[in-house]
Amino acid sequence: EPTMYGEILSPNYPQAYPSEVEKSWDIEVPEGYGIHLYFTHLDIELSENCAYDSVQIISGDTEEGRLCGQRSSNNPHSPIVEEFQVPYNKLQVIFKSDFSNEERFTGFAAYYVATDINECTDFVDVPCSHFCNNFIGGYFCSCPPEYFLHDDMKNCGVNCSGDVFTALIGEIASPNYPKPYPENSRCEYQIRLEKGFQVVVTLRREDFDVEAADSAGNCLDSLVFVAGDRQFGPYCGHGFPGPLNIETKSNALDIIFQTDLTGQKKGWKLRYHGDPMPCPKEDTPNSVWEPAKAKYVFRDVVQITCLDGFEVVEGRVGATSFYSTCQSNGKWSNSKLKCQPVDCGIPESIENGKVEDPESTLFGSVIRYTCEEPYYYMENGGGGEYHCAGNGSWVNEVLGPELPKCVPVCGVPREPFEEKQRIIGGSDADIKNFPWQVFFDNPWAGGALINEYWVLTAAHVVEGNREPTMYVGSTSVQTSRLAKSKMLTPEHVFIHPGWKLLEVPEGRTNFDNDIALVRLKDPVKMGPTVSPICLPGTSSDYNLMDGDLGLISGWGRTEKRDRAVRLKAARLPVAPLRKCKEVKVEKPTADAEAYVFTPNMICAGGEKGMDSCKGDSGGAFAVQDPNDKTKFYAAGLVSWGPQCGTYGLYTRVKNYVDWIMKTMQENSTPRED
């Protein structure tokens, strides 16, 4: 507890102090007082620097004195032999004695009293900015007129803060402008405008005179502008050193004027006004701004329209334009939206064709569809090249967004048939020579594939079995080979309406209109062993002449076998119909005159015994296309004959092209269209 005075005596005083003693006293007087410490008696063993025994006086970290030896007063009217005056309210006294004393020493007697200190004069640092007033135990600061004492109770300043300017235009000046501004002041001015307006400050150079910076470039007095997280300044000196027009990009501005104790100048004057907040004319790639202006400000609205081939994607929805508003913060709304290249996406796959994985699916990218050559070709033209258009679709110059259609190439065998007359009436053949050849197992017969979904055959083949099992792609027809070949499943059988159905088909003498179509449930995949034969054209080019050669193929009866195991084929010439009429019917079921011959029939054969026979029915009589020698078309279908190994009769397919096309169109699937 602080005291105003006190006494300090060495141990055993006034008797001799003991050896090896260390004792300390902590003196404390009230705040605002100093300490006067004085010794009235001092008898301590003398040594150099008082190394043996001593009394030490310490103030804070500073040793005020160290005493030893004997002292006596110089003043007969005063008992004081040594004294210390400190302007602080705390002091420590430490007494030390060593292990031996040569004589008997009595120590010391000391007293302390609290003394008033003059804070206004006793310290290097003046405690008050203006007027300092001392009193016993303390001091207080005071200020000249129009100044006020700050909260620190030491500094005086003028009352220049707290002004808030909300008008869109105004003028602000330093206190007393153009007279010298007050020293030691901090003036804060606030400009607060409506959101969407930025504060623009304008100054004239001559309206600014503030104490210049020190040698290190630090302003002693300074003017600072603070707008949000942006600061302009500090500024000082003669003539405004900053930009004469300050666009703060903020609706709130704090002006801070700080002065020190010295060097007052005339100060400063500024004008401010509120500008609608500008939004930057951003460079948004691949787009056009409407309206186009040199400058956009708060509340301006623009429509940003993407160039062709670009779109703005928001979530999953793509649009070609969007609106953006200049906001109060000087930023555009929807600023995250960008015009990106249209993405056409992964191109759709097509049946029997492919499209290479594109390097890019963005606007302007190019892809190429190809058909699985040589078995398919592009039916609807266009070349297969598509580019990613501005509307996000893959577009072809000819077809537009319609996809190409790969349809089977018809009438082109992978290997040409080389006829050899080693077997009377025909040769071994490979299915690759006749990839259109279809095998019917009940009855044992043939047919011709004419496209992915349709098989052409003779009416008499399917009249007794409307759900025939058919196979394609195999040269041999053993059970094991058929199991490895492609089985075709019929969906419906269409027999020509002109074919007369009989109760006893075995007695048939009229084979007119011996033609039928089988619609398949699933499309046939084409390849080297399976591909269709063409149909004849309707022009006169497809009218057969006597001697024209055609190929027949099948697994029908041969000289050695009732049924062939491996495909057989022969090349036959077209013959006049009378040649067929002249041949005697083998095992006739009726009078020879009863057999009907019509223009719907082709007669062919007669050379070297080459002919179709039982089991070949429905197979194609394939003739080279007169307009494209690489292709074969089905000129006829194996129908009937008077006698194997002579002449045979074939259904004249040309006469039925209209019926074939109509039947296929009326019974096509949406997938095929």
């Epitope: 290997e415 080389e418 080693r422 071994d428 490979d430 059970t479 062939a564 491996r566």
Partner: antibody, heavy 118, light 107 residues
Framework: EVQLVESGGGLVKPGGSLRLSCAAS????????MSWIRQAPGKGLEWVSY????????YYAHSVKGRFTISRDNAKNSLYLQMNSLRAEDTAVYYC???????????WGQGTLVTVSS | DIQMTQSPSSLSASVGDRVTITCQAS??????LNWYQQKPGKAPKLLIY???NLETGVPSRFSGSGSGTDFTFTISSLQPEDIATYYC?????????FGGGTKVEIK
């Protein structure tokens, strides 16, 4: 007169290769499917390989698949059997045979002996 | 693979005797079967095709029958020149396979 004459047989070490040839005459070679058939000493017949008229279709016995290759040259009226990675069990008389029609072998060569031994 | 089991593996008969050889397939082969004759040191010769059809130029004492899995080859009257090994051969599926052979000798 129809003739099929095999050649190219002989002694070869295991792992070695041989190429057998069959020269055809007296008929139109390109008309016929052809086959190789072998017969190990004192054993029965074993079908080895078959080739179509044009040479586009070929079949092999499991025991030789991947090691033997059948081929033909219609211009030279010749049938070939390239035998690689030969094994002791490939030792046999190798016949080339004409497939008259539908897998019936109506003409055979006299055979050529292949011996695989170290 | 289709296995062809031929029996007997050998037989001895007198001239004029009726000789029967059987061949059994491990699965149905329809009538896709041929019979061959091989005389010692010679190449085989086609006798019967499609199980029952006699090849041109082959004596009529040779005949074949059967369908599916069981087949029979018959020499109605054995002749001295018939001494040979006889093989059945299926062509229903690849790989084509032969029977083990039946060696026919004269007593």
């Amino acid at each position: 007169e129809v003739q099929l004459v095999e050649s190219g047989g002989g002694l070869v070490k295991p792992g070695g290769s041989l190429r057998l040839s069959c020269a055809a005459s007296g008929f139109t070679f390109s008309d016929y499917y052809m086959s190789w058939i072998r017969q190990a000493p004192g054993k029965g017949l074993e079908w080895v390989s078959y080739i179509s008229r044009s040479g586009s279709t070929k079949y092999y016995a499991h025991s030789v698949k991947g090691r033997f290759t059948i081929s033909r040259d219609n211009a030279k009226n010749s049938l070939y059997l390239q035998m690689n990675s030969l094994r002791a069990e490939d030792t046999a008389v190798y016949y080339c045979a004409r497939d008259e029609t539908d897998y019936a072998y109506d003409e055979w060569g006299q055979g050529t002996l292949v011996t695989v031994s170290s | 693979d289709i296995q062809m089991t031929q029996s007997p593996s050998s037989l001895s008969a007198s001239v004029g005797d009726r000789v029967t050889i059987t061949c059994q397939a491990s699965q149905d082969i329809s009538n896709y079967l041929n019979w061959y004759q091989q005389k010692p040191g010679k190449a085989p010769k086609l006798l019967i095709y499609d199980a029952s059809n006699l090849e041109t130029g082959v004596p009529s004492r040779f005949s074949g029958s059967g369908s599916g899995t069981d087949f029979t080859f018959t020499i109605s009257s054995l002749q001295p020149e018939d001494i040979a090994t006889y093989y059945c051969h299926q062509y229903e599926d690849y790989p084509l396979t032969f029977g083990g052979g039946t060696k026919v000798e004269i007593k």
